[in-house]
Amino acid sequence: SASSRRRQQSRNRSTQSQDVSRGSGSSDYNGSELKTACKKHELYVSFQDLGWQDWIIAPKGYAANYCDGECSFPLNAHMNATNHAIVQTLVHLMNPEYVPKPCCAPTKLNAISVLYFDDNSNVILKKYRNMVVRACGCH
Amino acid sequence: SASSRRRQQSRNRSTQSQDVSRGSGSSDYNGSELKTACKKHELYVSFQDLGWQDWIIAPKGYAANYCDGECSFPLNAHMNATNHAIVQTLVHLMNPEYVPKPCCAPTKLNAISVLYFDDNSNVILKKYRNMVVRACGCH
């Protein structure tokens, strides 16, 4: 029935990702400028650029990557949105000045191993957690 | 030595949160307006306002909350920042037009139980995961 279809649409909105029926929506900040949907972007970080070359021996840098893009209604399956993010997206639609859109953040992070000098000039090999973005989502 | 102190400062920057030596930083968007640091904000969501009152029986709404605020350098301990977020903050300082600041996102989410009508008008009690923001952090 129409009412059950309506319920299903509403339920889909809150509990699973929806099909994207339009673009990612316009930016809150830049007028009519369209931002791409939330996704992982490639980024190589050089430790020299961060000024860490004096204490990090290896690697010289690493593929850190980062997340960026819009989390606009409707959130599609690629956006790995939580139920809360879906609810927040709907509240943002009604009250954009009060509640921001969910933000595009890492959903999977990997570690890297770093060889560095400690304070006593000992060479240490250590694994640093949550250094590399593997996947992004709307949170 | 000075060099070891410098190394320690750098190391702290990438592997743990730093003490905040100034305010939360200025907003990217509005000139001199200061935005508060990333934190949890209270938000009650009414299912009627979302248009879900036809299929959700109870509760009438819930305290969903949301995350908002700046993730600016230096990231303090309250910001639950990942190592990647700390690196990204430093890269943003160097290249703000290319790499955004980390975003303020939920770090802890809770479930809620919802009583609703399914498509066959059966009354169902279901636990929906990740519906309530308990804590926020820079990601």
Partner: antibody, heavy 118, light 108 residues
Framework: EVQLVESGGGLVQPGGSLRLSCAAS????????MSWVRQAPGKGLEWVSA????????YYTDSVKGRFTMSRDNSKNTLYLQMNSLRAEDTAVYYC???????????WGQGTLVTVSS | EIVLTQSPGTLSLSPGEGATLSCRAS???????LAWYQQKPGQAPRLLIY???SRATGIPDRFSGSGSGTDFTLTISRLEPEDFVVYYC?????????FGGGTKVEIK
């Protein structure tokens, strides 16, 4: 009592600029979103722009994007509308209005007239 | 963008009569986000009804609102002399906040 008082209107040539102000009192200004709404002479109401309580998020109607900038100074309880590249069709009474969460505009200021003419 | 169409553009009635003003949305909207305003000449608009049917503070009970989906109505049960002014509906559920073109209630 909640009060909103607009100022800064006047006559300006096409292509010129003007800055409107709205002084707020009687409520915790920084807790509320605010909007500007305009009304051309003898015409209906048109929403122009909105801003979040912190000033971090702004929204504009398509016809003013890139020309108008809305801002606020919460320490002065004042709302602003910077209008650049003004056109004849921007001629209107400009009202500021408070918009509580999940609510319509209430109250409104008395308005300030902006006339764009050569 | 939700377009609101008000009808009639002008309503000619006598004091004491009832008035029915219509506001039609281009797509279904939540009644929670539909408002009505009254505007007297030379004055700012004043909020009458919010949430389609709730009267704002200080609004006389001769004003009532109803409707859902795409069709909303403002009813004035007995027109007083001060009611012969312009009325606007508004959708305030997200930007752009849109207004109807207005209905002028005039004395016949």
């Amino acid at each position: 009592e909640v009060q909103l008082v607009e100022s800064g209107g006047g006559l300006v040539q096409p292509g010129g600029s003007l800055r409107l102000s709205c002084a707020a009192s009687g409520f915790t200004f920084s807790s509320y979103a605010m909007s500007w709404v305009r009304q051309a002479p003898g015409k209906g109401l048109e929403w122009v722009s909105a801003i979040s309580g912190s000033g971090g998020r702004t929204y504009y109607t398509d016809s003013v994007k890139g020309r108008f900038t809305m801002s606020r100074d919460n320490s002065k309880n004042t709302l602003y509308l910077q209008m650049n590249s003004l056109r004849a069709e921007d001629t209107a009474v400009y009202y500021c209005a408070k918009r509580p969460y999940n609510s319509p505009f209430d109250p409104w200021g008395q308005g300030t007239l902006v006339t764009v003419s050569s | 963008e939700i377009v609101l169409t008000q009808s009639p553009g002008t309503l000619s009635l006598s004091p004491g009569e009832g008035a029915t003003l219509s506001c039609r949305a281009s797509q279904s909207v939540s009644s929670s986000y539909l408002a009505w305003y009254q505007q007297k000449p030379g004055q700012a608009p004043r909020l009458l009804i919010y949430g389609a049917s709730s009267r704002a503070t200080g609004i006389p009970d001769r004003f009532s609102g109803s409707g859902s989906g795409t069709d909303f109505t403002l009813t004035i049960s007995r027109l007083e002399p001060e009611d012969f002014v312009v009325y606007y509906c508004q959708h305030f559920g997200g930007t752009p906040f849109t207004f109807g073109g207005g209905t002028k209630v005039e004395i016949k």
